[in-house]
């Protein structure tokens, strides 16, 4: 017997927002939260907020981490509050870059 | 070069079952969304799903939830669409598309397949 | 369901001319929306996503505008090759839906 396929209950989740995309609010609302790290011009970049569509934060999520970049991606309210994303290299930090919060 | 090469024809009768494959080249097919589609003839687009290859989500629109069943074997970067209980109504042609992130759309699409339901 | 509405059904033109076809969103969609070309027996072709930005290797003479529910897609300049049908897509929410497509035809 074939399994039963799961019914999709498609929703939006209010996420933490952090960056430039985010103007002047500090939240979104979208069907996935995220948290990004990235490298640019020799800072740490850290950004949170929300994919909108389901299908773009899959894609984006399921790009794995690379040297210069990471986000990490959940499903649910405030889920990405306490989630910092990491680069793949545990404990050490790349030469000539600093911590910088894009606010 | 991306290509999605579609398999033949098919002509099947009522209430029979019908699997279709799409086959990858120049890409792996766990890196994108492999999405379906149908087009009856003189007829619109329908969108059926999609499936993630990677870890096998599925999205189904409703119209198709009891129809479709998209699988995949990444093995042999194939994926498939399989149509049950089939009636006049499924005779059309079944778009594969691949979904990417750089226009997050259907980018590349197969050259199709014909299905044919009459007994 | 995001019902999509798009005008006119068909449409002649001459060589040369411009053609403006329109996409209704029964809710807002963002800029969410892909308009695709498909000659017969041929799979749809991607000419334009996120309403307004051009796929790569179209030509410039097909352009997308809009935002939220209405939206427009325009050819300059037909050429021969144009004459095909054209359809708009929304991908924000599931189940993903098209337009009833616009079937352009030689004057």
């Known amino acids: 017997v074939e399994d039963e396929k799961p019914k999709v209950n498609q929703k939006l989740y209010m996420c933490v927002c952090e960056g430039l995309s985010c103007g002047n609010e500090d939240h979104c609302e979208g069907q996935q939260c995220f948290s990004s790290l990235s490298i640019n011009d020799g800072f740490h970049v850290y950004q949170k907020g929300c994919f909108q569509v389901y299908e773009q934060g899959k894609m984006t999520c399921k790009t794995p981490p690379s040297p210069g970049q990471a986000v990490e991606c959940c499903q649910g309210d405030w889920c990405n509050r306490n989630i910092t994303a990491q680069l793949p290299t545990k404990g050490k930090s790349f030469p000539g870059t600093q911590n910088f919060h894009l606010e | 070069e991306v290509q999605l090469q579609q398999s033949g024809a098919e002509l099947v009768r009522p209430g029979a079952s019908v699997r279709l494959s799409c086959t990858a080249s120049?890409?792996?097919?766990?890196?994108?969304?492999m999405h379906w589609v149908k087009q009856r003839p003189e007829q619109g687009l329908e969108w059926i799903g999609w499936?993630?290859?990677?870890?096998?989500?599925?999205r189904y629109a409703p119209n198709f939830q009891d129809k479709a069943t998209i699988t995949a074997v990444t093995s042999s970067n194939t994926a498939y669409l399989q149509l049950s209980s089939l009636t006049s109504e499924d005779s059309a042609i079944y778009y594969c598309?691949?979904?990417?992130?750089?226009?997050?759309?259907?980018?590349?699409w197969g050259q199709g397949t014909s299905v044919t339901v009459s007994s | 369901d995001i019902q999509m509405t798009q005008s006119p059904a068909s449409q002649s033109a001459s060589l040369g001319e411009s053609v403006t076809f329109t996409c209704l969103a029964s809710q807002t969609i963002g800029t969410w929306l892909a308009w695709y070309q498909q000659k017969p027996g041929k799979s749809p072709q991607l000419l334009i996503y996120?309403?307004?930005s051009l796929a790569d290797g179209v030509p410039s003479r097909f352009s997308g505008s809009g935002s939220g529910t209405k939206f427009s897609f325009k050819i300059s300049s037909l050429q021969a090759e144009d004459f095909a049908s054209y359809y708009c897509q929304q991908l924000y929410w599931t189940p993903w839906t098209f337009g009833g497509g616009t079937k352009l035809e030689i004057k």
């Open positions: 996120a309403a307004t």
């Open positions: 598309a691949r979904y990417t992130s750089r226009y997050y759309t259907m980018e590349y």
């Open positions: 499936i993630d290859p990677e870890d096998g989500e599925t």
């Open positions: 120049g890409f792996n097919i766990k890196d994108s969304l």
